[in-house]
């Protein structure tokens, strides 16, 4: 439906509060280095303009597209070239190229200071002094650090952030109330950002078809009672929502997401029996709840898949008539029967089925050619099952920290060219699969583990894309979205790698390590471990373990010493010498 003024349409649909919040998120995701105050000023100007268009849709410039309006506004920033360099060249382009240019300059790892959490009294004071500014600042800080964060979901996080402060700043023990809530929001926020980053990568690097395939599989698992036509409609709508958000069209995205939630709730009887509670909630909670809703029960007595997809004489006819529809039906039918499979496995099976049909439908006897296609699935299913079994056993044996260390060593040997901070971050996240998924029963392990690993490996891919250093990473990241994890799993030690020169400074530690949190201390030790492997890629597990045990003892000893700094200096030299000897450096 065409509107005279798109900006007026979205302002009226979303309301002023959400409109302003979404414009702020959009601007902060594009211009990640701009100060908060500058963004607020731009947002206020856009909002005032939108109000004039609501009053009179025929007013000057009200007919312009949102990209034109927002792009023009962003291009008024005075320090664009000094701050962003070549991104300023985007402003010389016309829409839609200008917006594409801004999108290409989004930085997944912006050079921004770590967010330091102030004292609780200071945070509560800031919250009470100006609640609106405090919450805007939250949106701004998250959006600029996570330029692909799912904007309507960020509104939900902000609502929970506000609730945490409203409750805890009037609590007796404010810190005990607030800090766990903020930790939870931080951890959930990072996970949400990473999940959305994979959706955007899927759309942008592999296209709409890849995303739709993912959505068919996931929604069919979640809504196994829904008809194929219903799932297809949901997939189409969901693809539109995510295409918009990943493309920076946040107002349209939020509006369409609200419409989709409304549609799902109005039609829950034909979608899922699990939606009732979600649909009683307010909009932001409702949309979040639907996105996280548990899988519905599978319909009883589903017929065998073989009848329609192997045994039928019409397989090639049906495939030829509408390839994607037929493959979509295959994926739907397979996924609704297999909530125990990861989405990426289901997509691998569908790809195998497609490849077989492409080959066999051109053969002399198609039916005889594809008759055993389901047998080809067996090794594809067993590979992730075995991998998860082995890694969960290792996790249970080692615990999370040591399991992360095992993965650090494994991945550093596979791709030693990758920067140490990236290897540490990615391996730590890979290691979290243990505590996240290994506690689940067999039927839930694979969807939990492999789909989580897809999200984490995508972090590696987007960080590596910014500064490519390894052909092996590039290959695994770009060849096939669904085979990324098997591709990385299959990598062996990189024999072409020339070990890094030894630098004593890398292994010099100071008393400040003693005041770090347990998590930060682990990161320091894991950083040292990666560096060790980069120096000595052929070091055995036993050698590395011995050095790391000595290192842990050294830190513990010096942190107990009266003169910590002297201890770190003197004992540190001894440790470096001993480690070099142990590793034969």
């Amino acid at each position: 439906d065409a509107h005279k003024s798109e900006v007026a349409h979205r302002f009226k649909d979303l309301g002023e509060e959400n409109f302003k919040a979404l414009v702020l998120i959009a601007f902060a995701q594009y211009l990640q280095q701009c100060p908060f105050e500058d963004h607020v000023k731009l947002v206020n100007e856009v909002t005032e303009f939108a109000k004039t268009c609501v009053a009179d849709e025929s007013a000057e410039n009200c007919d312009k597209s949102l990209h034109t309006l927002f792009g023009d506004k962003l291009c008024t920033v005075a320090t664009l070239r000094e701050t962003y360099g070549e991104m300023a060249d985007c402003c010389a382009k016309q829409e839609p190229e200008r917006n594409e240019c801004f999108l290409q300059h989004k930085d997944d790892n912006p050079n921004l200071p770590r967010l330091v959490r102030p004292e609780v009294d200071v945070m509560c004071t800031a919250f009470h002094d100006n609640e609106e500014t405090f919450l805007k600042k939250y949106l701004y800080e998250i959006a600029r650090r996570h330029p692909y964060f799912y904007a309507p979901e960020l509104l939900f996080f902000a609502k929970r952030y506000k609730a945490a402060f409203t409750e805890c700043c009037q609590a007796a023990d404010k810190a005990a109330c607030l800090l766990p809530k903020l930790d939870e929001l931080r951890d959930e926020g990072k996970a949400s950002s990473a999940k959305q980053r994979l959706k955007c990568a899927s759309l942008q690097k592999f296209g709409e078809r890849a995303f739709k395939a993912w959505a068919v599989a996931r929604l069919s698992q979640r809504f196994p009672k829904a008809e194929f036509a219903e799932v297809s409609k949901l997939v189409t709508d969901l693809t539109k929502v995510h295409t918009e958000c990943c493309h920076g069209d946040l107002l349209e995205c939020a509006d369409d997401r609200a419409d989709l939630a409304k549609y799902i709730c109005e039609n829950q009887d034909s979608i899922s029996s699990k939606l009732k509670e979600c649909c009683e909630k307010p909009l932001l909670e409702k949309s979040h709840c639907i996105a996280e809703v548990e899988n519905d029960e599978m319909p009883a007595d589903l017929p065998s898949l073989a009848a329609d997809f192997v045994e039928s004489k019409d397989v090639c006819k049906n495939y030829a008539e509408a390839k994607d529809v037929f493959l979509g039906m295959f994926l739907y039918e397979y996924a609704r029967r297999h909530p125990d499979y990861s989405v990426v496995l289901l997509l691998r099976l569908a790809k195998t089925y497609e490849t077989t049909l492409e080959k066999c439908c051109a053969a002399a006897d198609p039916h005889e050619c594809y008759a055993k296609v389901f047998d080809e699935f067996k090794p594809l299913v067993e590979e992730p099952q075995n991998l998860i079994k082995q890694n969960c056993e290792l996790f249970e044996q080692l615990g999370e920290y040591k399991f992360q260390n095992a993965l650090l060593v494994r991945y550093t040997k596979k791709v030693p060219q990758v920067s140490t901070p990236t290897l540490v971050e990615v391996s730590r996240n890979l290691g979290k699969v243990g505590s996240k998924c290994c506690k689940h029963p067999e039927a839930k392990r694979m969807p939990c583990a492999e789909d989580y690993l897809s999200v984490v490996l995508n972090q590696l891919c987007v960080l590596h894309e910014k500064t490519p250093v390894s052909d092996r990473v590039t290959k695994c990241c770009t060849e096939s979205l669904v085979n990324r994890r098997p591709c990385f799993s299959a990598l062996e030690v990189d024999e072409t790698y020339v070990p890094k020169e030894f630098n004593a400074e890398t292994f010099t530690f100071h008393a400040d390590i003693c005041t770090l949190s347990e998590k930060e201390r682990q990161i320091k030790k894991q950083t040292a471990l990666v560096e060790l492997v980069k120096h000595k890629p052929k070091a055995t597990k036993e050698q590395l373990k011995a050095v790391m045990d000595d290192f842990a003892a050294f830190v513990e000893k010096c942190c107990k010493a009266d003169d910590k700094e002297t201890c770190f200096a003197e004992e540190g030299k001894k440790l470096v010498a001993a480690s070099q000897a142990a590793l034969g450096l």
Epitope: D121, T125, E167, A171, A172
Partner: antibody, heavy 124, light 107 residues
Framework: QVQLLQSGAEVKKPGASVKVSCKAS????????ISWVRQAPGQGLEWVGW????????KYAQKFQGRVTMTRDTSISTVYMELSGLKSDDTAVYYC?????????????????WGQGTLVTVSS | ELVLTQSPSSLSASVGDRVTITCRAS??????LNWYQQKPGKAPKLLIY???RLESGVPSRFSGSGSGTDFTLTISSLQPEDFATYYC?????????FGQGTRLEIK
């Protein structure tokens, strides 16, 4: 302006219960906690407990644990304090008071607005 | 529980006098101390929060100081309307506690 309006005086027999109400106006009710403080005739101030108006969570002084219940009705911006098993030494003026916001970097939980007080007399 | 001891329990002073009331905590309470004024038959009124911050609308002749365990409330020049009972209150830990009060009367 910010106001806390309490219910009227009560006379109760020992062993009975009393429920005092405190209606807030002039501010966002769920943004501020409410404390209850009592004052026996000619005596000092004694803290009874506190309610988080946002979550409904409560904290009571040990002395009143098991006898006091604080609740709130956000739809009418009202807090209630019910004290059961009344004894003669529960005779006092009961005040509700608003916990002030954190200001200038400190959450002093000062009681910045007080109700007018409700006299509860326990007598056989 | 944390005990607050006010001194003196009562004092007599004249209009224009400088008056100091002290409040000692049985353990450190940082700056989580507030001062109230109460007149007969009325509810208490907040004067000072966070040990030294003047509540808005309170005359500047009132001031507070201290941290840890020792705190003072000072009235620089007594006015007729200042004759009342003064209470300190700590909010560092639950249960919240009040001092026993200091009665300030006209000499």
């Amino acid at each position: 302006q910010v106001q806390l309006l309490q219910s009227g005086a009560e006379v109760k027999k020992p062993g009975a219960s009393v429920k005092v109400s405190c209606k807030a106006s002039g501010y966002t009710f769920t943004s501020y906690g409410i404390s209850w403080v009592r004052q026996a005739p000619g005596q000092g101030l004694e803290w009874v407990g506190w309610i988080n108006t946002y979550s409904g969570g409560t904290k009571y002084a040990q002395k009143f644990q098991g006898r006091v219940t604080m609740t709130r009705d956000t739809s009418i911006s009202t807090v209630y304090m019910e004290l059961s098993g009344l004894k003669s030494d529960d005779t006092a003026v009961y005040y509700c008071a608003r916990l002030g916001h954190c200001q200038r970097g400190i959450c002093s939980d000062a009681l910045d607005t007080w109700g007018q007080g409700t006299l509860v007399t326990v007598s056989s | 529980e944390l005990v607050l001891t006010q001194s003196p329990s009562s004092l007599s002073a004249s209009v224009g006098d400088r008056v100091t009331i002290t409040c000692r905590a049985s353990q450190s309470i940082s700056r989580y101390l507030n001062w109230y004024q109460q007149k007969p038959g009325k509810a208490p009124k907040l004067l000072i929060y966070g040990a030294s911050r003047l509540e808005s609308g309170v005359p500047s002749r009132f001031s507070g100081s201290g941290s840890g365990t020792d705190f003072t409330l000072t009235i620089s020049s007594l006015q007729p309307e200042d004759f009342a009972t003064y209470y300190c209150q700590q909010s560092d830990s639950v249960p919240v506690t009040f001092g026993q009060g200091t009665r300030l009367e006209i000499k």
